[in-house]
Amino acid sequence: ITCPPPMSVEHADIWVKSYSLYSRERYICNSGFKRKAGTSSLTECVLNKATNVAHWTTPSLKCIRDPALVHQRPAPPSTVTTAGVTPQPESLSPSGKEPAASSPSSNNTAATTAAIVPGSQLMPSKSPSTGTTEISSHESSHGTPSQTTAKNWELTASASHQPPGVYPQGHSDTT
C-alpha cells in the first residue's frame, strides 16, 4: 500500500522521495516566505485502518511573508528567481514534533495563510474513506465529481476522461 501524491500547500513546494507507508516528507516555504512559528512542515503517509487506504497527514504549515525581506530593495531582474525555495531547518523527531520557527509569531495582517488542497485519490478500486478525522483522507468518487469540489468548479456529471486503456494508478499498489 502506498500513498497518492500529497496535497499542495500555498507558498510551499515539496519533493516526494517515497510514497511508502510511514514515510515522512517535508514542505519547504518558497523564496520570500518562511514557516510561521508553531506550524509544522511535516507530512506522513499513514494508513486509515477502517478502509485500508493510505493518505498523507495534513501539515499545519503556514508560509508567511518573511519580514526580514519586506524592506529590502528588490533584486535586479537578472537575478530574480521565481521558483526558489528557502530551506528552514527543523528537527525530525520520532514524535513528529518540531521546534517552532525562531522568529516570534506576530499578528501580521499581511501574512498569507496556507490554503490546503486535499490530496488526490489514485486508487479508484478502493472504497471511499470513512471514519477518519484527517482532512487529507481521500475519497474516491469512482468517476463522478466529488461532493467536495474545489471552489468555482462548474462541471457536468459526465464520466471521467481517461486515456484508452490507462488508469490513474499513480504510485498506488494493491495488496
Partner: nanobody, 117 residues
Framework: EVQLVESGGGLVQAGDSLRLSCIAS????????MGWFRQAPGNEREFVAS????????VYDDSVKGRFTISRDNAKNTVYLQMNSLKPEDTAAYYC??????????WGQGTQVTVSS
Amino acid sequence: EVQLVESGGGLVQAGDSLRLSCIASGRTLSYPDMGWFRQAPGNEREFVASINWSGTGRVYDDSVKGRFTISRDNAKNTVYLQMNSLKPEDTAAYYCAARVGTEFQYWGQGTQVTVSS
C-alpha cells in the same frame, strides 16, 4: 465537462529541454489542482508534478527535482511542464490531469516524449 489537451512532446537528445503544455477547456470558471503524470511502456502511470490553483503550491516527485518545473497561466487555462536536462529514463507518454475535489479525475490523451541517448 472538462477537456484537457496536451502538446509539446517530441523526440529530443539527452540533456535537451522540452516544454509541455496542457490547455483546459469546458464548463468551468477556474481550475483547481492540475498535475502531470507519465507512463512508460510496461510501467504503471506515475506522478510527476502538480500545482494548485493560485500557482503558489507545487508538488514534485523527487525523480525530477531540479530538472522539471510546473507552472500555470490561468488567463490562458494552461498548465506547463518545463523539462530540462532530459534523460532517456524520462521517455514516456505524459498526461495532464485535473483534480476535482480530492482526486485527479479528468485526463488528457497524452503527449509522447522520447529522449534518445
